[in-house]
Each structure stands twice: as structure tokens, then as C-alpha cells.
Interface confidence: low
């Protein structure tokens, strides 16, 4: 019977011919009696025998990750009758793997979203690199991640290449960030290849700024002759958040006289101040109101940001209209 | 390599304003958040604003009413001018650059001295 | 009077360890802002020697080290040297005045 043992050849070997194995029929006493034969997809192209000793030989350099296996076929012959001298046997050659690929990143780029403020170890995304190299094969296409940037904000789980927030953010300082992540593998032991990515998070808005006044005063002045409902000016408070974040509503906290009403225009997110009764120089020709603003919308959770409402003073002056 | 150079006149009078620029060179100022810092004489750090790229500002509430911070992608520069100035406003004046929140890249410092 | 809280002053042999302590409140380290260390040579501008708690900026020898507890922290230097007679300063963020905040700084000699 043919006698053979399990061929492996290494993949990327640059000798011009690497002996794999030798397969040999039981019956050959070694007095070059035989003739041993090669034959299938490879045969004397890539493999090469011995036609006397059943010596094979690799005469290419192999690349596993393009080809993992060739399966050839195997003859031997009586030389001098010109017969089989066994069943026509079916072998197989299996490429072994180097650690010759590094980690690829194949779905970049990568970009996240996540909320400003939020806590250590939320979420923010996973990325995931693949490598050519045989998994199976040692530690080869086993792979670690680390963080090469973005420390201390941002961390990664070496095993899984998910990225958590290791540290509060502010949108208001910084809106965004790049992060870079970089895969290697045989678990990062020496020999080891490595791919880097690029991460872009965006930190999206959270209420946590409150509006506050531009000014601490305002001077508006008033006709006497003015009706009820004139717009007599605006006041403008800013807020460092963008979108519903930033819209405010302003109104009045101290009016004793009750002259005045502030509405807010939702547009310009200014506040309009109203002539809400008419006014006499005559009775009086100056007032003093304190009006506050607030956010418009704050989730139970942000409350802690919108403690005591931003507050200005507002000094109208009347103006005398000659009475007939 | 990021580099910052403050440049404004190292003696200013009383009640005057106070005006400071910083020079960005090495990389762009439209990203990250751009600070003041001083340091009077024998004594600590006090921050006093920051300006975003975006533009929006934020001010230390004790020099709030008399500080203005402002920005000029177009020179890649960014200036404070602080009004009403007393002598207590003497000090070395830093411009530096915020990852987030800290300070990562600092200029060498100007001494401003507020004196008649 | 700095919101941040630091010793005056520290002293050390040459190989000895010091620390510096910084002391802050619910409303900044307590909060869960990171601290952040400077160092300032004589007659230059503050250096960051430790950002985030305990990293180090490339270039700034293992010596230093930073760590955080609660509402305070700590910067440990190892085999003291000549050239770290610096002063000292820690860092945070400030929620109460959306901004930041600086230790009144810690001098450090060298004996």
C-alpha cells in the first residue's frame, strides 16, 4: 500500500525548491525499480516528485490566503512491465500560514455620535478589523486593539475594539474628536502586524448651559403717548447650546407697578418688552423692572445646570408728549 | 508641532484697556478651544475666558464684565482685550490652547505691568 | 484663595519621592472632572506634565505620576532630580463657574 505521511508547506518560502515529503509504495525496496508519477491541478508547475524516490518538492512560492490546498493525484509503476504497481491514490498538500497580513479595518471610515457629559463607560462604537492570516493557525490573525489617540477621553476594549467614554466631555469646549485605533495581531507578541484606524466622534448637544443675560442692564425709553401693547425693546440673553437646547423664555420677576409684560420671540430668541398699561409722565416719569430668563426645555436630569435663572435690570424712562 | 506667541504692548495706564494677541502657527485655529491665562507676579494661575473656533466664548465670572475675547481664523489669531484696568491686573499673560480639559499647548507668556 | 487647594510647599532629597496633594470640592474633582498637573520651571511658562488624572504626555519621564480619589489627587515624583525644583500646579474644572480652576500651586525644592 502507498505509505505517506500529512504534507504541510509553508507559505512565502523563497527557496527555490523546498522538499515537503516523500510517498512511496510499501512495495518498493528501493532498487529504482519504480517510477512514481504526479499528477492533477499543480502537478509539475508548483509540485515536482522524484520519479525514483517519490521525493515532492514545492518549486513556487505558495500564498495560503490565496490557495490553502491542493489536492493531486499519485501513480506508481512498475518500470519494467509498465504496470500500476498500486491504486491511482488521491493526496492532499496543505499551505501552512506565516503571519504575513496585517489587520485590516474594512469598514472605515468610522464615525459616532454621541452625547456631550455622557458617563464613563458609555458606548460609542465598536470597530472591527479582519485578518487574512489562517485563524486557526497560532496567534496569527488573533487580535488586540489599543488606543494610539484619545486618551483620557475615550478608551478601548483590547478584545472586542469597543470604544467607551472613560471621561466627561463638553460639547462647548470641543465638539469633536479623532481617535485612532490601532489592531495587532498575534495577541501583540513579537512579530506581530499591526493596522490603524480612524475614529471621528461628534459630540451632540446636551442642555447643560443656561441662558444668560448680555447685559446686566438695559435702558428702554417709552412715549406716554404709547398704547397698551407697544413693543417699547428687546433684551437678548446668550447660550452656549445650539438647536431646542438654546431656545429661552424670558419674562418678568419684579414689576411692582405692573406696566410691563416681556414676551419672547421664538425666531431671534430675544425678548420684547410690552407696554402693558399706558403710562403718565406726569405720575411717573421712570420705572425699574428685573426680567429673568430661562430655558424652554430641560430634562429632569440637566436641572442641576439651570439653577437660579440668569436675571437683568431694566431701567424705562418716560417721555413727556405735549398734551393739548 | 503646535506653537503659540503672545504679542500686545507690556505696559498699559490705569482704567485703559488692555489688548493681547496670540499667533497660531503649526496647525489650524478653526478646531479646538483657545484660552487666557495670567499669573501676577509671585503668585498661582488664573484662567480668565476661552473662545471656541465656532466663536462662542465663555469668561471667569470675577473679570467677566470687563473681558472680551475674540477670534480671526483669516490670521490664525485670537486676542483679549480687557478693560478698566487697575494695577492688579499686572501679571504675565499666557495664551494657550484646550484639549478639551486641559491645557496642552502653552505660549512663552508677556508681562503686562498697568502703571501711570 | 484658589478653589483648588495645594501645600505651599514640598521638599525633597535627590532620589527621594515627594507627592503633592490638591484638594477640591463636589462641584470639581468630585463632579468626576479629571485633574490635571503643570509644571513651571523658573522664569518660563507652565509645562502639562500629567493630563487626565495620570497620563503622561510623550516626553515626561516615568518619574511623574498622577492619581485621583474622591475630591482630591495627587502628583507622586519618584528619584528626585535637580532640575524638578518647579513649581507645582494642579487643575480642574469648575462646574459652579463653567470654567476652569487652578491649585495656588506648590513649590518644590530640592535639597
Known amino acids: 500500500g502507498w505509505v505517506w505521511n500529512q504534507f504541510f508547506v509553508p507559505e512565502e518560502m523563497n527557496t527555490t525548491s523546498h522538499h515537503i515529503g516523500q510517498l512511496r509504495s510499501d512495495l518498493d525496496n528501493g532498487n529504482n525499480s519504480f517510477q512514481y508519477k504526479l499528477l492533477g491541478a499543480g502537478a509539475g508547475s508548483t509540485f515536482i516528485i522524484d520519479e525514483r524516490t517519490g521525493d515532492i518538492y514545492a518549486i513556487q512560492k505558495l500564498d495560503r490566503e490565496e490557495r490553502s490546498l491542493y489536492i493531486l493525484r499519485a501513480q506508481v509503476i512498475d518500470i519494467a512491465t509498465g504496470r500500476a504497481v498500486e491504486p491511482e491514490s488521491e493526496f492532499v498538500i496543505k499551505v501552512s500560514d506565516i503571519n504575513d497580513n496585517e489587520p485590516k479595518f474594512l469598514d472605515e471610515p468610522y464615525e459616532a455620535i454621541v452625547p456631550e457629559m455622557s458617563p464613563e463607560g458609555t458606548l460609542v462604537i465598536q470597530v472591527t478589523a479582519s485578518d487574512a492570516d489562517d485563524p486557526s493557525s497560532g496567534n496569527n490573525a488573533r487580535l488586540l486593539y489599543s488606543l494610539l489617540q484619545g486618551q483620557p477621553y475615550f478608551s478601548v476594549e483590547p478584545t472586542t475594539g469597543v470604544i467607551r467614554i472613560s471621561s466627561k466631555m463638553d460639547r462647548e469646549l470641543q465638539d469633536e474628536y479623532w481617535v485612532i485605533i490601532q489592531a495587532k495581531d498575534m495577541i501583540g507578541q513579537p512579530g506581530a502586524l499591526s493596522g490603524t484606524t480612524s475614529v471621528l466622534i461628534k459630540l451632540s448637544d446636551v442642555n447643560d448651559n443656561k441662558p444668560i443675560f448680555k447685559e446686566s442692564l438695559y435702558r428702554l425709553t417709552v412715549s406716554e403717548s404709547a398704547p397698551t401693547g407697544t413693543s417699547i425693546g428687546t433684551i437678548m440673553a446668550y447660550d452656549n447650546d445650539i438647536g431646542e437646547n438654546a431656545e429661552m423664555d424670558y419674562s418678568i420677576e419684579e414689576d411692582d407697578s405692573q406696566t410691563f409684560d416681556i414676551i419672547t420671540n421664538h425666531e431671534t430668541q430675544e425678548g420684547i418688552v410690552i407696554l402693558k398699561k399706558k403710562v403718565d409722565f406726569e405720575h411717573q416719569n421712570h420705572y425699574g423692572i428685573r426680567a429673568k430668563v430661562k430655558n424652554h426645555h430641560v430634562p429632569e436630569q440637566l436641572m442641576k445646570y439651570h439653577t437660579e435663572a440668569s436675571t437683568t435690570f431694566i431701567k424705562i424712562q418716560v417721555e413727556d408728549v405735549d398734551e393739548p | 508641532q503646535v506653537q503659540l506667541q503672545e504679542s500686545g504692548p507690556g505696559l498699559v495706564k490705569p482704567s485703559e484697556t488692555l489688548s493681547l494677541t496670540c499667533t497660531v502657527s503649526g496647525g489650524s485655529i478653526s478646531s479646538y478651544s483657545w484660552s487666557w491665562i495670567r499669573q501676577p507676579p509671585g503668585k498661582g494661575l488664573e484662567w480668565i475666558g476661552y473662545i471656541y473656533y465656532s466663536g462662542s466664548t465663555n469668561y471667569n465670572p470675577s473679570l467677566k464684565s470687563r473681558v472680551t475675547i475674540s477670534l480671526d481664523t483669516s490670521k490664525n489669531q485670537f486676542s483679549l482685550k480687557l478693560s478698566s484696568v487697575t494695577a492688579a491686573d499686572t501679571a504675565v499673560y499666557y495664551c494657550a490652547r484646550n484639549w478639551a480639559f486641559h491645557f496642552d499647548y502653552w505660549g512663552q507668556g508677556t508681562l503686562v505691568t498697568v502703571s501711570s | 484663595q484658589s478653589v483648588l487647594t495645594q501645600p505651599p510647599s514640598v521638599s525633597g532629597a535627590p532620589g527621594q519621592r515627594v507627592t503633592i496633594s490638591c484638594t477640591g470640592s463636589s462641584s470639581n474633582i468630585g463632579t468626576g472632572y479629571d485633574v490635571h498637573w503643570y509644571q513651571q520651571l523658573p522664569g518660563t511658562a507652565p509645562k502639562l506634565l500629567i493630563y487626565?488624572?495620570?497620563n503622561r504626555p510623550s516626553g515626561v519621564p516615568d518619574r511623574f505620576s498622577g492619581s485621583k480619589s474622591g475630591t482630591s489627587a495627587s502628583l507622586a515624583i519618584t528619584g528626585l532630580q535637580a532640575e524638578d525644583e518647579a513649581d507645582y500646579y494642579c487643575?480642574?474644572?469648575?462646574?459652579?463657574?463653567?470654567?476652569?480652576?487652578f491649585g495656588g500651586g506648590t513649590r518644590l525644592t530640592v535639597l
Open positions: 487626565g488624572n495620570s
Open positions: 487643575q480642574s474644572y469648575e462646574s459652579s463657574l463653567s470654567g476652569w480652576v
